[in-house]
């Protein structure tokens, strides 16, 4: 069957969530096949490990692709110590990694 590379999006935490004292940054991969994909988080260009969780949807009934969300969870205090948040995605259909990022406070 055919390969579909993911579309990648990054979402900062909501103001409402920040008020609760935590910060979740979400990297969303949409409509990809096959299922294997790798997401790496970087904060101010430093690789993060151990503080993210992934959730993969089942295959879409229409086009048999997958979606995946990776959530980086930090305390509000840690979140506000840093500026640049990025997720880097690799997939067999991509010739080079796709990176999506945002600068805290500018979105």
């Amino acid at each position: 069957r055919t390969v579909a590379a993911p579309s990648v999006f990054i979402f900062p935490p909501s103001d409402e969530q920040l008020k609760s004292g935590t910060a979740s940054v979400v990297c969303l991969l949409n409509n990809f096949y096959p299922r294997e994909a790798k997401v790496q988080w970087k904060v101010d260009n430093a690789l993060q490990s151990g503080n993210s969780q992934e959730s993969v949807t089942e295959q879409d009934s229409k086009d048999s692709t997958y979606s995946l969300s990776s959530t980086l969870t930090l305390s509000k205090a840690d979140y506000e110590k840093h500026k640049v948040y990025a997720c880097e995605v690799t997939h067999q259909g991509l010739s080079s990694p796709v990176t999506k990022s945002f600068n805290r406070g500018e979105c």
Epitope: T90, H91, P97
Partner: nanobody, 121 residues
């Protein structure tokens, strides 16, 4: 140091066939996915096909599905791309690449130098 060497490119008429080879040295390919990409002038490099580990199948780009077949010979440390019913839009430099891990993550750490395929009458 891993080295990948493509061969088999050339000039072919529309509707013709070519078989590309990619010979690997410095790493035993049997545990890794081997992929083919191509790059046409002025365009981004695009995925063509991947041969996963033996038994895990092969996958293709929509544009080549049914015309191209990827295969591998782990004993020879070589992957092949059989290209049939070639079209002018298949004209490009074809590259092979090897996954950096066994997870099929698409982290391509080594690339060949490429072989030119030109489809023209």
């Amino acid at each position: 140091q891993v080295q990948l060497q493509e061969s088999g490119g050339g000039l072919v008429q529309p509707g013709g066939s070519l078989r590309l080879s990619c010979a690997a040295s410095g790493r035993t390919i049997s545990r890794y996915a081997m992929s083919w990409f191509r790059q046409a002038p002025g365009k981004e490099r695009e995925f063509v096909a991947v041969a996963r580990r033996s038994g895990d199948g092969a996958f293709y780009a929509d544009s080549v599905q049914g015309r191209f077949t990827v295969s591998r010979d782990d004993a020879k440390n070589t992957v092949y791309l059989q290209m049939n019913s070639l079209k002018p839009e298949d004209t490009a430099v074809y590259y092979c690449a090897i996954d950096s891990d066994t997870f099929y993550s698409g982290s391509y750490d080594y690339w060949g130098q490429g072989t030119q395929v030109t489809v023209s009458s």
